[in-house]
């Protein structure tokens, strides 16, 4: 069942988003997502991931940058930037620690 989270080791992550229910969350990995909606300032959300690990490997665009990491509170001090309209060379480490 692709929707059911796997029963693997969990990591504790900083949680700062409207979906948080506490200061931290637990999941299979930690995430930072920087999103810019049309006509608004970019918003950075920190939390946990359990599904769709493939999002971690996506390249940054001018609208979204998705970062993942796998250690305790590893998403706490990460700051992301969005890609310029004309993207430069590929940014490494979007699925790193």
């Amino acid at each position: 069942d692709p929707v059911k989270p796997s029963r693997g080791p969990l990591v504790t992550c900083t949680c700062e988003s409207p979906h948080c229910k506490g200061p931290t969350c637990r999941g299979a990995w930690c995430t930072v997502v920087l999103v810019r909606e049309e006509g608004r300032h970019p918003q950075e959300h920190r939390g946990c991931g359990n599904l769709h690990r493939e999002l971690c490997r996506g390249r940054p665009t001018e609208f979204v940058n998705h970062y993942c990491c796998d250690s305790h509170l590893c998403n706490h001090n990460v700051s992301l930037v969005l890609e310029a309209t004309q993207p430069p060379s590929e940014q490494p480490g979007t699925d790193g620690q």
Epitope: R7, T12, P18, K21, G22, P23, G27, N50
Partner: antibody, heavy 125, light 112 residues
């Protein structure tokens, strides 16, 4: 750093009222589900109740012994949690802890990772 | 409500020796996702409780690896491989499967 500081405890007569406060800092309080847990002198831990974040409906749940007498509320602008205790009984005598924690993203699981130092409520004539 | 039962009530231990605490629930705490919704807390003398183990067997951050949690369904065990003097206090199990969350009565660990 997450910090929870309770206040408002004291001595009250049976049938009286008291309001406890919990000042929170170091995290986005408005997102957090907050609970009260109490401990009678020399006894074990007992969950009192919980309030969800406003984004999750802001609903409250209570343990059977306090339902209808205790009310949990929150002021997100002040990062403060409250426990209004009415019709107090001698068996409500306890240290009251404010707590919040950690949820597992794939389900409704929630643990209590962060605790205040507690405030003592004594109900006695 | 789910009833949590701990044993023993009191556990005298010798530093350096292992220790084990049992916790039983009145119904299964195994969630469909494969995790057991069972936590262990330690309350040291004069302090607030602290989380030791979550989801049955996962150590909370900063908890020494001499602590381990095991079990599934209704039977759970907290083990301390080599007790240290700082481990004294009251240990509680708690089920987090249903509201209200409920605690066991506690096990007081003290040095012999």
């Amino acid at each position: 750093e997450v910090q929870l500081v309770e206040s408002g405890g004291g001595l009250v007569k049976p049938g009286g009222s008291l309001r406890l406060s919990c000042a929170a800092s170091g995290f986005t309080f408005s997102n957090a589900w907050m609970s009260w847990v109490r401990q009678a002198p020399g006894k074990g831990l007992e969950w009192v109740g919980r309030i969800k974040s406003k984004s999750d409906g802001g609903t409250t749940d209570y343990a059977a012994p306090v339902k209808g007498r205790f009310t949990i509320s929150r002021d997100d602008s002040k990062n403060t949690l409250y426990l209004q205790m009415n019709s107090l009984k001698t068996e409500d005598t306890a240290v009251y802890y404010c707590t919040t924690g950690n949820y597992y993203d794939g389900s409704g699981y929630y643990s209590f990772d962060y605790w205040g130092q507690g405030t003592l409520v004594t109900v006695s004539s | 409500d789910i009833v949590m039962t701990q044993s023993p009530l009191s556990l005298p231990v010798t530093p350096g020796e292992p220790a084990s605490i049992s916790c039983r629930s009145s119904q299964s705490l195994l969630h469909s996702n494969g995790y057991n919704y069972l936590d262990w807390y330690l309350q040291k003398p004069g302090q607030s409780p602290q989380l030791l183990i979550y989801l049955g067997s996962n150590r909370a951050s900063g908890v020494p690896d001499r602590f381990s949690g095991s079990g599934s369904g209704t039977d759970f065990t907290l083990k301390i491989s080599r007790v240290e003097a700082e481990d004294v206090g009251v240990y509680y199990c708690m089920q987090a499967l249903q509201t209200p969350p409920t605690f066991g009565g506690g096990t007081k660990v003290e040095i012999k």
